[in-house]
């Protein structure tokens, strides 16, 4: 399960403080649940690890956009 994330409701309490290279990322999930203390992103890496990140950071937003474009381009 994601680093620093609760099981019952997926929340991020701590976020990674370093950039993950885009080529290591597979997908992401937005966390906006009201029961979570903050909005966050959970990135899933190609090795299957899940990591919380702060969407206010530029690299996080750029990575999300990159993944959006890849996902859309993979569609038939």
């Amino acid at each position: 399960q994601p680093d620093s994330v609760s099981i019952a409701i997926t929340c991020c309490f701590n976020v990674i403080n370093r950039k993950i290279p885009i080529q290591r990322l597979e997908s992401y999930t937005r966390i906006t649940n009201i029961q979570c203390p903050k909005e966050a992103v959970i990135f899933k890496t190609k090795r299957g690890k899940e990591v919380c990140a702060d969407p206010k950071e530029r690299w996080v937003r750029d990575s999300m956009k990159h993944l959006d474009q890849i996902f859309q381009n993979l569609k038939p």
Epitope: R30, T32, I34, K38, K56, K65, D68, Q72
Partner: antibody, heavy 117, light 107 residues
Framework: QVQLVQSGAEVKKPGSSVKVSCKAS????????MHWVRQAPGQGLEWMGR????????KFDPKFQGRVTITADTSTSTAYMELSSLRSEDTAVYYC??????????WGQGTTVTVSS | DIQMTQSPSSLSASVGDRVTITCKAT??????LAWYQQKPGKAPKLLIS???SLETGVPSRFSGSGSGTDYTLTISSLQPEDFATYYC?????????FGGGTKVEIK
């Protein structure tokens, strides 16, 4: 739970300014972005701009650039939107909303601003 | 700026009807689309984000679909409380823009 409570209705003269407040509870505003959206009578929704309360960084629709100021006070969990050089077309309901991703999951109740001579 | 064109601007329907509202962007928005419901005198309520993700507490009769520039909101069986105005909004790039709205009225 999250609540965004806005200041009361305002009646303003053309050429003047208005400042609307939005007090948040149930969340730390420095963790999110606070946006302002307006809606003229019988019209659709129009995004004006947003602030990152953690550092004061703002982004605006170019249509409002130079006429709108968005500020935030993290000590009181309050965001503010000031619109200057008011004209009759600025008569609208002004909403604050939160959302770091660019969509808005919690909204204030709205503040009616009427611009009339 | 990305323009959002919503259609129809209004529609009349009966309770139990299936209702479809469409939204077209002037460029690819990569599923960064939200749908809102607004009732008179009230703030908008977020229904769907990311084109398809239903918000917590939103009834399952609401669904979103689409990709690229074309997106759809469907209400599978219209209920009395669903009569309202619906807006789409792109959040791919600022300035964030809304569609013109679709007013769903009682037939």
């Amino acid at each position: 739970q999250v609540q965004l409570v806005q200041s009361g209705a305002e009646v303003k003269k053309p050429g003047s300014s208005v400042k609307v407040s939005c007090k948040a509870s149930g969340l730390t505003i420095s963790d999110t972005y606070m946006h302002w959206v307006r809606q003229a009578p019988g019209q659709g929704l129009e995004w004006m701009g947003r602030i990152d309360p953690a550092n004061g960084n703002t982004k605006f629709d170019p249509k409002f650039q130079g006429r709108v100021t968005i500020t935030a006070d993290t000590s009181t969990s309050t965001a503010y939107m000031e619109l200057s050089s008011l004209r009759s077309e600025d008569t609208a309901v002004y909403y604050c909303a939160r959302g770091v991703f660019g969509f808005f999951d919690y909204w204030g109740q709205g503040t009616t601003v009427t611009v009339s001579s | 700026d990305i323009q959002m064109t919503q259609s129809p601007s209004s529609l009349s329907a009966s309770v139990g009807d299936r209702v479809t509202i469409t939204c077209k962007a002037t460029e690819d928005i990569y599923n960064r689309l939200a749908w809102y419901q607004q009732k008179p005198g009230k703030a908008p309520k977020l229904l769907i984000s990311g084109a398809t993700s239903l918000e917590t507490g939103v009834p399952s009769r609401f669904s979103g679909s689409g990709s690229g520039t074309d997106y759809t909101l469907t209400i599978s069986s219209l209920q009395p409380e669903d009569f309202a105005t619906y807006y789409c909004q792109q959040f791919w790039s600022a300035p964030y823009t809304f569609g013109g709205g679709t007013k769903v009225e009682i037939k």
